[in-house]
């Protein structure tokens, strides 16, 4: 058993049929010694008396808010949560496996630049009695500070018969060094509590591996005289790290016909303009990627050829 | 060329070669997801690689103030990786074909380090740890770790030379 926060405790249980469970000793936080009784949740049934209560925790029915009283007055509470371990593996019932970029990916994180700011998100089908708490650091043995905000519900989607809820959190490294080569990964830890079930999820990454620039901005077309060619120009996204002579992007320009089956013409360039042939009913799209490190491409910025 | 005394390197040449290094490093190990190398044991194996750290003066301001600190750090790293890529880690099994980008990567690391430090000038170099894994799986794991680490190192070096070519070239 360990303390998650004040008066909230997590009991770690091996979860299998007829498992013996864990013996837990609760101590009433009071100077009083006599006349103390214990109850669980809303029940008035007295579970025991005395300053300590010893219980055998085997299942969710044994978890909940234990309260010690004296003469009708509440002295203190202890909330017991269960953390299940099945076949040596901690349960992951609360969050959905996003399966990208690999199986058992519950947390996904992205950064728009090298400033040390990043966003993580996760999915669940649970709509009520759900709380999250997020901690982060750079490195684990001698951790350096990363400050995370509160997790918030950021999207709701309908998937078949199910509703899916997306939560996200923003974090900022306290002393970020954008130009340095990271040697210690960022660690992100999410505590999830659903009713009386506790689970924790972790992710470890370098900022450089989760970079995804915003799409290029101010995408414009300039027709070239007496030609089917156009000059496409764009600018670095505002959110990208500066100076651009140091934090450079590379770009992919695509001409795509109306039909998905039409052949796509693609040009790669380090410049912020390119000359392409604009076909009728086609659109021109541009996306960006770090020039020197192959992290994710941005989403496309698009304009119609007409 | 950068010499210990402090003259400027051939920024544009260094920029071109460092960008080529980035491309080659990703050709040699394009995958990110097929093996989470930080989950595998063996941490000490790549903890000794020289990293370009915050105080090394490789940020835009540091380069403007005095690029020599940064260039020396980059040179150190280039020599370190050049030695690793020429070692048994990359010559043993699993077999690399002669068309492997590792060969070109090895030659380009040497080329860039020579651009930074011509014959006759000597910056101190970091000792390369004596790693001689006997098993193919250990060797492959080390290769992947070294190449992932090299990708990060040459990305910073390429940014330095691109910025230098754009703002510090005579």
């Amino acid at each position: 058993i360990w303390e998650l926060k004040k008066d909230v405790y997590v009991v770690e249980l091996d979860w299998y049929p007829d498992a013996p469970g864990e013996m837990v000793v609760l101590t009433c936080d009071t100077p009083e010694e006599d006349g103390i009784t214990w109850t669980l949740d809303q029940s008035s049934e007295v579970l025991g008396s005395g300053k300590t209560l010893t219980i055998q925790v085997k299942e969710f029915g044994d978890a909940g808010q234990y309260t010690c009283h004296k003469g009708g007055e509440v002295l203190s509470h202890s909330l017991l949560l269960l953390h299940k371990k099945e076949d040596g593996i901690w349960s992951t019932d609360i969050l959905k496996d996003q399966k990208e970029p690999k199986n058992k990916t519950f947390l996904r994180c992205e950064a728009k630049n090298y400033s040390g700011r990043f966003t993580c998100w996760w999915l669940t089908t649970i709509s009520t009695d759900l709380t999250f708490s997020v901690k982060s650091s750079r490195g684990s043995s001698d951790p350096q500070g990363v400050t995370c905000g509160a997790a918030t519900l950021s999207a709701e989607r309908v998937r078949g018969d199910n509703k899916e809820y997306e939560y996200s959190v923003e974090c900022q490294e306290d002393s970020a060094c954008p130009a340095a080569e990271e040697s210690l990964p960022i660690e992100v830890m999410v505590d999830a509590v659903h009713k009386l079930k506790y689970e924790n999820y972790t992710s470890s990454f370098f900022i450089r591996d989760i970079i995804k620039p915003d799409p290029p901005k101010n995408l414009q077309l300039k027709p070239l005289k007496n030609s089917r060619q156009v000059e496409v120009s764009w600018e670095y996204p505002d959110t990208w790290s500066t100076p651009h002579s140091y934090f450079s992007l590379t770009f992919c320009v695509q001409v795509q016909g109306k039909s998905k089956r039409e052949k796509k013409d693609r040009v790669f360039t380090d410049k912020t303009s390119a000359t392409v042939i604009c076909r009728k009913n086609a659109s021109i799209s541009v996306r960006a990627q770090d020039r020197y490190y192959s992290s994710s491409w941005s989403e496309w910025a698009s304009v119609p050829c007409s | 060329r950068a010499v210990p005394g402090g003259s400027s390197p051939a920024w544009t040449q260094c920029q071109q070669l460092s960008q080529k290094l980035c491309t080659l490093a990703w050709s040699a190990h394009p995958l990110v997801g097929h093996m989470d190398l930080r989950e595998e044991g063996d941490e000490e194996t790549t903890n000794d690689v020289p990293h370009i750290q915050c105080g090394d003066g490789c940020d835009p301001q540091g380069l403007r103030d005095n690029s020599q600190f940064c260039l020396q750090r980059i040179h150190q790293g280039l020599i370190f990786y050049e030695k690793l890529l020429g070692s048994d880690i990359f010559t043993g099994e699993p077999s690399l074909l002669p068309d492997s980008p590792v060969g070109q990567l090895h030659a380009s690391l040497l080329g860039l380090s020579q651009l930074l430090q011509p014959e006759g000038h000597h910056w101190e170099t970091q000792q390369i740890p004596s790693l001689s894994p006997s098993q193919p799986w250990q060797r492959l794991l080390l290769r992947f770790k070294i190449l992932r680490s090299l990708q990060a190192f040459v990305a910073v070096a390429a940014r330095v030379f691109a910025h230098g070519a754009a703002t510090l070239s005579p």
Epitope: - | S95, L97, P98, G103, Q135, L140
Partner: antibody, heavy 120, light 107 residues
Framework: QVQLVQSGAEVKKPGSSVKVSCKAS????????IHWMRQAPGQGLEWIGY????????KYNENFKGKVTITADDSTSTAYMELSSLRSEDTAVYYC?????????????WGQGTLVTVSS | DIQMTQSPSSLSASVGDRVTITCKAS??????VAWYQQKPGKVPKLLIY???TRHTGVPSRFSGSGSRTDFTLTISSLQPEDVADYFC?????????FGSGTKLEIK
């Protein structure tokens, strides 16, 4: 896109020789090794060897040394595999293939195969 | 030479079944193993490399696992178009060698 086009089927007498060609297109011919494999009827694959056109250096499976000669002609972007002293057990489909660009020998692109039949 | 012992040599399964093919290397090959699919009269097609990485365009029902000497190709839900021969291949050591193949049929 990368393509490997092999020469047509051959029927040969025991003791004779055969030369199979593999014309490559869609990439720089001298940049990559070209490998040869064979597959006897109803059998698995056997790796014969490769040539690296950049330095004209072949490497052979020891089991095929003296039996096979692999060459390349940069001017036509074509690799050749010559089999000598043919015997009936050399009857097989012969494939050329090129590996991944990362320098390890898993094969992404294959020729369509050339059936060599050795029969008296 | 490294022997790649592949089993079973043939198997028959129903559409939707989970199918597993194994390959045992005679010595450590790290994860330098690829899997190919060869349909009748066609050339081999790469499915998996580095023991578990799916090649571009290969359906997600195909997966690979294993390291050092023991490797597995799994088809999570067999489809009619999966009828083919399957080969493992080690590219760790010269000469590169292949398994003898598994002929997969639909019941």
């Amino acid at each position: 896109q990368v393509q490997l086009v092999q020469s047509g089927a051959e029927v040969k007498k025991p003791g004779s020789s055969v030369k199979v060609s593999c014309k490559a297109s869609g990439y720089t011919f001298t940049d990559q090794t070209i490998h040869w494999m064979r597959q006897a009827p109803g059998q698995g694959l056997e790796w014969i060897g490769y040539i690296y056109p950049r330095d004209d250096s072949p490497k052979y499976n020891e089991n095929f040394k003296g039996k096979v000669t692999i060459t390349a002609d940069d001017s036509t972007s074509t690799a050749y595999m010559e089999l000598s002293s043919l015997r009936s057990e050399d009857t097989a489909v012969y494939y050329c293939a090129i590996p991944d660009r990362s320098g390890y020998a898993w094969f992404i692109y294959w020729g369509q195969g050339t059936l060599v039949t050795v029969s008296s | 030479d490294i022997q790649m012992t592949q089993s079973p040599s043939s198997l028959s399964a129903s559409v939707g079944d989970r199918v597993t093919i194994t390959c045992k290397a005679s010595r450590d090959v790290a994860i330098a193993v690829a899997w190919y699919q060869q349909k009748p009269g066609k050339v081999p097609k790469l499915l998996i490399y580095w023991a578990s990485t799916r090649h571009t365009g290969v359906p997600s029902r195909f997966s690979g696992s294993g390291s050092r000497t023991d490797f597995t190709l799994t088809i999570s839900s067999l489809q009619p178009e999966d009828v083919a021969d399957y080969f493992c291949h080690q590219y760790s050591s010269y000469p590169f060698t292949f398994g003898s193949g598994t002929k997969l049929e639909i019941k």
